[in-house]
Interface confidence: low
């Protein structure tokens, strides 16, 4: 685990213990696409309520209606899925209640018995046209990273064709995935080219690879499953954020760190700095400067905005998030280009969240 020496910023306020936080797994509200959804903010004495979705302020629009303690979503779409929160602000404190919205077809909420979606993927080939395996519906395979709340059902699909009809097998973290590898086992729906795991738990996290093969060839596709524990746990940071960025001298740039934490999270943006020409102190620890941290005087701590950057601003920016149980951190690099060079966004490097196990 990285050791952080906050020698450069001694004015950092000590983190206050959270007054209240949600320990339970938030309720999951499931809606089919097109349906309307109404959720009541389950907070007492909620005089002034603000709403967020995935950490971003949620305001009313043509499909979202906010009336008192109720949130209404009309004509829900999969884009409405996410982690929602309502915050009741009072004179002495504030309290937040979290809930998940899952706009999807029935299978992802656990009912897979009447799954007709995918029957068309089981393609029968003319027996004379020998063909190596191929994907028949890559659209259903685009979402590689699946972040799923614990206790939910997960379905991975690899719709394929070929002649003779290929077989499908599944690997977890590159090794044969056996029923005894998880409590409750899993289901394979060969006709739908799918793997289904019910009631996922943290030990289900990992890479799942479908291998589809016949005598003429083999293809594979890998999904990454992250099980989001909605209970007091170390913070979880969305993979790939903050993302590497580049800008010209004088330009502006934003780093975003998306945090999932039930216990009150404390967010810090930290940068390696030099002191007397050295990056490291006499104790061998790096000099670090806290650029921004969550607290009373800080606006959205998940976003670090840098304005009118200079070459000195180039380097690694660390988003460090801690709660009373643990911490996590991820970093991104800022490249500052000379003015004559056109700015371009660097290729984003997706890193697995640092769970600091």
């Amino acid at each position: 685990r990285p050791s952080f020496s906050l020698v450069e910023d001694t004015t950092l306020e000590p983190e206050e213990p959270p007054t209240k936080y949600q320990i339970s797994q938030p309720e999951v509200y499931v809606a089919a696409p097109g349906e309307s959804l109404e959720v009541r903010c389950l907070l007492k004495d909620a005089a002034v309520i603000s709403w967020t979705k995935d950490g971003v302020h949620l305001g009313p629009n043509n499909r979202t209606v906010l009336i008192g303690e109720y949130l209404q979503i009309k004509g829900a779409t999969p884009r409405d899925s996410g982690l929602y929160a309502c915050t009741a602000s009072r004179t002495v404190d504030s309290e937040t209640w979290y809930f998940m919205v899952n706009v999807t077809d029935a299978i992802s909420s656990g009912d897979d018995e009447d799954d007709t979606d995918g029957a068309e993927d089981f393609v029968s080939e003319n027996s004379n046209n020998k063909r190596a395996p191929y994907w028949t519906n890559t659209e259903k395979m685009e979402k590689r990273l699946h972040a799923v709340p614990a206790a939910n059902t997960v379905k991975f699909r690899c719709p394929a064709g070929g002649n003779p009809m290929p077989t499908m097998r599944w690997l977890k973290n590159g090794k044969e995935f056996k029923q005894e590898h998880r409590i409750g086992g899993y289901k394979v729906r060969n006709q739908h080219w799918s793997l289904i795991m019910e009631s996922v738990v943290p030990s289900d996290k990992g890479n799942y690879t479908c291998v589809v093969e016949n005598e003429y060839g083999s293809i594979n596709h890998t999904y990454h499953l992250d099980v989001v524990e909605r209970s007091p746990h170390r913070p979880i940071l969305q993979a790939g954020l903050p993302a590497n960025a580049s800008t010209v001298v004088g330009g502006d740039v934003e780093f975003v760190c998306k945090v999932y934490s039930d216990a009150q999270p404390h967010i810090q943006w930290i940068k390696h700095v030099e002191k007397n020409g050295s990056k490291y102190g006499p104790d061998g620890l790096p000099y670090l400067k806290v650029l921004k941290h969550s607290g009373i005087n800080s606006s959205n701590a998940e976003v670090l905005a840098l304005f009118n950057v200079t070459e000195a601003d180039a380097g690694e920016y660390i988003c460090k998030v801690s709660n009373y149980i643990g911490q996590a951190n991820q970093s991104a690099w800022l490249t500052v280009l000379p003015k004559q060079q056109a700015p371009g966004r660097e290729k984003e490097i997706t890193a697995s969240p640092d769970y600091l196990e």
Epitope: R1, P14, E15, P17, K20, Y21, Q22, I23, S24, Q25, A150, A151, P202, E229, S231, P232, H233, R234, S322, Y324, I325, G326, Q327, L356, E357
Partner: antibody, heavy 117, light 110 residues
Framework: EVQLLESGGGLVQPGGSLRLSCAAS????????IHWVRQAPGKGLEWVAV????????YYADSVKGRFTISRDNSKNTLYLQMNSLRAEDTAMYYC??????????WGQGTLVTVSS | QSVLTQPPSASGTPGQRVTISCSGS????????VNWYQQLPGTAPKLLIY???QRPSGVPDRFSGSKSGTSASLAISGLRSEDEADYYC???????????FGGGTKLTVL
């Protein structure tokens, strides 16, 4: 293998002090909150205190607030419970337990504290 | 007096199904997940059920948990003599900001 081993219990007079230790092994101690839970002879479990992974947050049961102090030394993989102004009703088996995913998933075998004159 | 209310005792014969209840309030069981612990005579407690209904690895599927509103319950099916123990429910209390336990239920296998 996750292991928690309590020590430091014994006989002490009312008003006296005692310091309990909990030595942890088999996991990354500095990543986990740890609880103290006690059980009086023939009685049920009573939560005493919890400390966060880095020691920055501490919570106590009302019955021990102001008398007991929970602390940890991550470099030694050790948890402590400093007990002052002990009373007869503090007599109990004291367990340390690891906090994980909203439950205490691993417990030590306990150390017995007897407060008597 | 425990914050969570459990029956002091329960009993059943081998093979039977037994249910142990746990009742709390909106600030504890009503808004937080419930855990269950088994304490065999002379031993430390052992986590049996966490987050209302999840079993840690190694716990037989004869043990199951559920929660509705401010009440939770532990069910043990196919009762065995080795299930004779004390069972405790536990959760977090958002008002006191601490862990709270039930008074415990002594299960006797007749």
């Amino acid at each position: 293998e996750v292991q928690l081993l309590e020590s430091g219990g014994g006989l002490v007079q009312p008003g006296g002090s005692l310091r309990l230790s909990c030595a942890a092994s088999g996991f990354t101690f500095s990543n986990y909150g740890i609880h103290w839970v006690r059980q009086a002879p023939g009685k049920g479990l009573e939560w005493v205190a919890v400390i966060s992974y880095d020691g920055s947050n501490k919570y106590y049961a009302d019955s021990v607030k102001g008398r007991f102090t929970i602390s940890r030394d991550n470099s030694k993989n050790t948890l402590y419970l400093q007990m002052n102004s002990l009373r007869a009703e503090d007599t109990a088996m004291y367990y340390c337990a690891r906090d994980s995913s909203s439950a205490e998933d691993y417990w030590g075998q306990g150390t017995l504290v007897t407060v008597s004159s | 007096q425990s914050v969570l209310t459990q029956p002091p005792s329960a009993s059943g014969t081998p093979g039977q199904r037994v249910t142990i209840s746990c009742s709390g309030s909106s600030s504890n069981t009503g808004s937080n997940t419930v855990n269950w612990y088994q304490q065999l005579p002379g031993t430390a407690p052992k986590l049996l059920i966490y987050r209302n209904n999840q079993r840690p690895s190694g716990v037989p599927d004869r043990f199951s948990g559920s929660k509705s509103g401010t009440s939770a319950s532990l069910a043990i099916s196919g009762l065995r003599s080795e299930d004779e123990a004390d069972y405790y429910c536990e959760t977090w209390d958002s008002n006191t900001r601490g862990v709270v336990f039930g008074g415990g239920t002594k299960l006797t296998v007749l």
